[in-house]
């Protein structure tokens, strides 16, 4: 007897059966079944994404494709070789033995066959073709990573080589720094005992100028003094030749007239036979209290009393009203003789005002009244000036009719502000005037445009602030 | 520092009009007064416009009332003179100047020349057909 089946096995494989008599001959088959769904991420017959979503995904799943491909080539071969070698000698015995019908049933198992080998085939060229495409991909993808690692290498060197280059460059500085800390420490060291020993120096030469300045008036003092003794016995002497040569002459006593030692202002000194400008001792009219006042013995025909002076900026002329009062400063350098002391001298006697300027461009000039003096304190040592000459303006620089004396802290000006705080200095301010001979002490170059400097506005008009400057009085009768 | 800068002279017809500039630095126009002031050859230097307390107080001498205004913009810190109707006798050198705002005489309201103490370089202007 003779019969054809087709089945399923467990494991879900078509299976054709062919009963021939005791002979039973069994087919398995690949299906297309067995194959994965086109719903897996690697379908068998789909087209491939554009690229993969990570190479070694990739890597594997062309791994796998070829298991596959290598599989289903080795069942081929395996196939045809049975074909080849069982098939033959059954296919005789098939041919001798069976009937007509059963070549009916041996030529559907060969279509079938065919229709799968050839299904198959058609399956494998596409896994081929997606394995190419892959394939292809991948070494594209491979030689653009290939590039991109080639030029982060470049980069990672040149970026090494520059870190090693500044590594290099900043050890140098550290250690360039280090030189310096330790050369600047060393020099610091050095500067400070440097310091140390010019401040005990600068404080020893202090004091001996000191004592120089003391021993210099005092020699000052004796020289006019043995000047004028000098004088005096010279006229002793002459008077005395002069009786002893008189043939009528009677024996009579030189009375010598008292020695004068103290003296009022600079033009008594000058008088008194000492000529030479210098710091001389001035006493108080009517009273034993002394100052120290600078003599100009040279301008004008000399005899002048300097009661102030600017020439450097080493004084500071922003004081108190006490200290305009009773004077500051050196008279061998900048100072302000004191107001008191002006205000009793010129209250006495008629006494005239010269005050000098130097401008910064080598420039002098002068203004002279005929009559100046101070009122007393209660008034403010207010000012008075009269009869103006000289080269340094046609009109006053000092308001007129005269101001109130005004100091940081005691406001006499006219002025809606307080002129000696805005201005700087003590002065006779009016709202706030065209001059301050006591404003602030400006160099050369930042001399101009200046609001609080020494100022003398009809000689070098408003802003400019002057190199130097000497207000000096005279009597009117000298 | 103190700086002022004018600009914007020239030269113009009779009837005409310019506007000057005065840019100053080193000070705030809060705390200061600005004048405006002229210099014709062979002349004294003379007031022209004064300006205080931002705008606030305004001075014209009698030779320019009527023709000139003088305004100032102090986040600028420029104070500005537009002159009108110019006449051949405003010809000189122009020249802005500053003062300390509170330089002022009890019961007064304008200030010496001699007060002010910050001055330009001048401008130009020239009046001429």
């Known amino acids: 007897y003779s019969n054809f089946r087709k089945s399923v096995d467990s494991t879900g494989r078509r299976q054709y059966q062919v009963q021939n008599g005791p002979c039973s001959y069994t087919f398995l088959l690949p299906e297309t079944d067995s194959c994965r769904s086109s719903s897996s991420p690697y379908m068998s017959n789909a087209v491939q994404r554009d690229a993969p979503l990570d190479y070694d995904d990739s890597v594997q799943r062309l791994q796998v494709l070829e298991n596959i491909l290598e599989n289903n080539t080795q069942w081929l071969m395996k196939l045809e070789n049975y074909i080849q070698d069982n098939m033959k000698k059954e296919m005789v015995e098939i041919q001798q033995n069976v009937v007509q019908n059963q070549t009916a049933v041996m030529i559907e198992i060969g279509t079938s066959l065919l229709n799968q080998t050839a299904a198959q085939t058609r399956k494998l060229t596409d896994v081929e073709a997606q394995v190419l495409n892959q394939t292809t991909r991948l070494e594209l993808q491979l030689l653009q990573h290939s590039i991109s690692t080639n030029k982060l290498e470049k980069q990672i060197l040149d970026q090494t080589s520059e870190i090693n280059k500044l590594q290099n460059k900043n050890s140098f500085l550290e250690q360039k720094v280090l030189d310096m800390e330790g050369k600047h420490s060393e020099q610091l060291q050095s500067m400070k005992e440097q310091k140390d020993e010019l401040q005990v120096l600068v404080s020893k030469q202090s004091s001996v100028i000191d004592e120089l300045e003391k021993k210099l008036v005092t020699a000052t003092v004796n020289n006019s003094l043995l000047q004028k003794q000098q004088h005096d016995l010279m006229e002793t002497v002459n008077s005395l030749l002069t009786m002893m040569s008189s043939p009528n002459s009677k024996s009579s006593v030189a009375i010598r007239k008292e020695e004068q030692t103290t003296f009022r202002d600079c033009a008594e000194i000058f008088k008194s036979g000492l000529t030479t400008s210098g710091i001389y001792t001035l006493t108080f009219p009517n009273s034993t209290e002394e100052i120290k006042a600078y003599c100009d013995m040279d301008v004008g025909g000399g005899g002048w009393t300097v009661i102030q002076h600017r020439e450097d900026g080493s004084v500071d002329f922003q004081r108190t009203w006490k200290e305009y009062k009773e004077g500051f400063g050196s008279p061998l350098g900048e100072y302000w003789l004191g107001n008191e002391f002006v205000s009793q001298l010129t209250g006495q006697h008629r006494y005239v005002l010269k005050i000098q300027l130097k401008d910064w461009e080598g420039n002098e000039a002068h203004s002279l009244y005929d009559h100046f003096y101070l009122a007393g304190e209660e008034s403010n040592y207010r000012i008075h000036l009269t009869g103006l000459t000289g080269t340094a303006g046609k009109i006053s620089s000092i308001s007129q009719p005269g101001s109130d004396f005004s100091t940081k802290d005691s406001d006499n000006d006219k002025c809606i502000c307080k002129c000696s705080q805005m201005l700087s200095g003590g002065w006779w301010f009016d709202a706030c005037g065209p001059s301050n001979l006591n404003g602030q002490y400006y160099p050369q170059k930042q001399n101009t445009n200046k609001f609080n400097g020494i100022k003398w506005y009809y000689w070098k008009g408003s802003g400019y602030s002057l190199k130097a400057t000497t207000m000096m009085i005279r009597p009117a009768d000298f | 520092e103190v700086q002022l800068v004018e600009s914007g002279g020239g030269l113009v017809q009779p009837g005409g009009s310019l506007r000057l500039s005065c840019a100053a630095s080193?000070?705030?126009?809060?705390?200061?007064?600005i004048g405006w002031f002229r210099q014709a050859p062979g002349k004294e230097r003379e007031g022209v416009s004064s300006?205080?307390?931002?705008?606030?107080?305004?001075y014209y001498a009698d030779s320019v009332k009527g023709r000139f205004t003088i305004s100032s913009d102090n986040s600028k810190n420029t104070v500005y003179l537009q002159m009108n109707s110019l006449r051949p006798e405003d010809t000189a050198v122009y020249y802005c100047?500053?003062?300390?705002?509170?330089?002022?005489?009890?019961?007064?309201?304008?200030?010496?020349?001699?007060?002010?103490?910050?001055w330009g370089q001048g401008t130009l202007v020239t009046v001429s057909s």
């Open positions: 100047a500053a003062v300390p705002a509170g330089r002022l005489r009890y019961g007064e309201q304008w200030y010496p020349i001699y007060e002010y103490d910050a």
């Open positions: 080193g000070i705030t126009l809060d705390d200061y007064a």
């Open positions: 300006i205080r307390d931002n705008g606030g107080s305004t």
